[in-house]
């Protein structure tokens, strides 16, 4: 997260880290005791999932292995449309005040809505500085029409933009798959942005979760 702040401890109990060994690979969001939602471009063969801590690599955090993941069938490695994936944990998480599932959206929030994005991604760009603490940034949803002025045909129909005019605050490497939460519901998953990160008026681009609720529910049901 560029130009963000340290999240209030315990304020994001649904935030998970997908680790490759001990190294941060992507963020993710707990949606059920067996399931984590993340970005399709974060796919690996297997995952070590850290839950219940704001510190990356926290020894006291829950760590659960995951060997199955389900990319959206319409994900394109070329255009990155449908950048959404469900990761099935090998064992259920122990829910607590530190580990909770996020609320999935009932509706799509409108442009102008205030949201918070979080992650352990680099806080500087192009040179990287990975924080140990979970970082947050407060952003607002941007209309597709406005966002297309910047990204033109790169912006797919189910992509959502967020940012703050003239501000550097944004997501970056390592934040991928992490949550954009608006009015206590999951509205976005970090998908992509321009580089170096934090260029003012280049919004962060997210997968618009409200458009995928049916796919999420059906996939979890099919692979119970």
């Amino acid at each position: 997260i560029i130009d963000g702040y340290k999240c209030k401890e315990g304020s994001h109990p649904w935030q998970v880290a997908l680790l490759k060994g001990n190294q941060l690979h992507c963020g993710g969001v707990l949606v059920d005791k067996y399931w984590v939602l993340t970005a399709a471009h974060c796919k690996m063969g297997q995952y070590q999932v850290q839950l219940g801590s704001d510190k990356i690599g926290d020894q006291s955090a829950q760590k659960i292995k995951a060997t199955k993941s389900f990319r959206h069938p319409g994900y394109s490695t070329k255009t990155h449309v449908n950048d959404i994936m469900l990761v099935r944990l090998d064992e259920p998480v122990k829910m607590s005040s530190k580990v909770e599932a996020v609320q999935l959206p009932e509706h799509c929030e409108p442009p102008g809505t205030s949201c918070t994005v979080s992650g352990w991604g680099t806080t500087t760009s192009p040179d990287v500085t990975f924080p140990s603490d979970l970082m947050c940034s407060d952003v607002k949803l941007i209309s597709s029409r406005e966002c297309k002025k910047v990204y033109k045909d790169l912006l797919g129909k189910t992509m959502l933009c967020a940012g703050i005019p003239d501000s550097k605050t944004n997501t970056c490497n390592g934040d991928s798959g992490g949550p954009l939460v608006c009015n206590d519901t999951l509205q976005g998953l970090v998908s992509w942005g321009t580089y170096p990160c934090g260029q003012p008026n280049d919004p962060g681009v997210y997968t618009q979760v409200c458009k995928y609720k049916r796919w999420v529910m059906e996939t979890m049901k099919t692979h119970r």
Epitope: K20, A39, A40, H41, T77, K78, T79, H80, D83, S125, P126, D127, V128, K152, D153, L154, T171, C172, N173, D175, S176, V190, S191, W192, G193, T194, Y195, C197, V205
Partner: antibody, heavy 127, light 108 residues
């Protein structure tokens, strides 16, 4: 300031393996923000991408050369290398190493432009 | 594979001229196109990335435009040091990364 320097034999016999090394100075090869790239240019011709490698040692090769190419990275020496097997006269070229700087992050991290280049090394395939 | 076609393959121009080079992709590559300049015996140099963004240290007389399949590199007022070969390059996902055939800008 980051600099790249290619090294290796200037003359290789047909059917042998061409081996080149690119040494990175003024910066670390261990940055997950960059790709490390090999490109070649036959005499009087245009540029041809050979392949790339990232910090995680994931490799990406030109389909036309894939069966003969190996790119590897040695983070301890701050170097990356190219091996091209079963060479013929058609592999005679100036070989460049370069840094691929991503144009995006996240899902768009794969898109990049080469912003730092070595000066190139001439390799002739001849008996 | 996506083919990149540059035109013209060569052109003659005078100092102070406005020069336009075009690059066409065989299918849409959004704005993932870069332009390079190469002088004889030297390595290429990145001029423009993401179709229209000027690389740091490159003079503002260079500009790029286009999206989808058609792209343009413009030199607003040609300078003596601009006589070189220019290449476009697409990078819309691996593999392969491909270059255009090049445009040689010569002195008239």
């Amino acid at each position: 300031q980051l600099q790249l320097q290619e090294s290796g034999p200037g003359l290789v016999k047909p059917s042998e393996t061409l081996s080149l090394t690119c040494t990175v100075s003024g910066g670390s090869i261990s940055s997950d923000d960059y790709y490390w790239v090999w490109i070649r240019q036959p005499p009087g011709k245009g540029l041809e991408w050979i392949g790339s490698i990232d910090y995680y040692a994931s490799t990406y090769y030109s389909p036309s050369l894939k069966s003969r190419v190996t790119i590897s990275v040695d983070t301890s020496k701050n170097q990356f290398s190219l091996k091209l097997s079963s060479v013929t006269a058609a592999d005679t070229a100036v070989y460049y190493c370069a840094r691929g700087r991503p144009l995006g992050y996240g899902a768009k991290h794969y898109y990049y432009g080469m912003d730092v280049w070595g000066q190139g090394t001439t390799v002739t395939v001849s008996s | 594979d996506i083919q990149m076609t540059q035109s013209p393959s060569s052109l003659s121009a005078s100092v102070g001229d406005r020069v336009t080079i075009t690059c066409r992709a065989s299918q849409s590559i959004s704005s993932y196109l870069n332009w390079y300049q190469q002088k004889p015996g030297k390595a290429p140099k990145l001029l423009i990335y993401s179709a229209s963004s000027l690389q740091s240290g490159v003079p503002s007389r260079f500009s790029g435009s286009g999206s989808g399949t058609d792209f343009t590199l413009t030199i607003s007022s040609l300078q003596p040091e601009d006589f070189a070969t220019y290449y476009c390059q697409q990078s819309p996902y691996f593999p392969p990364l491909t270059f255009g055939g090049g445009t040689k800008v010569e002195i008239k």
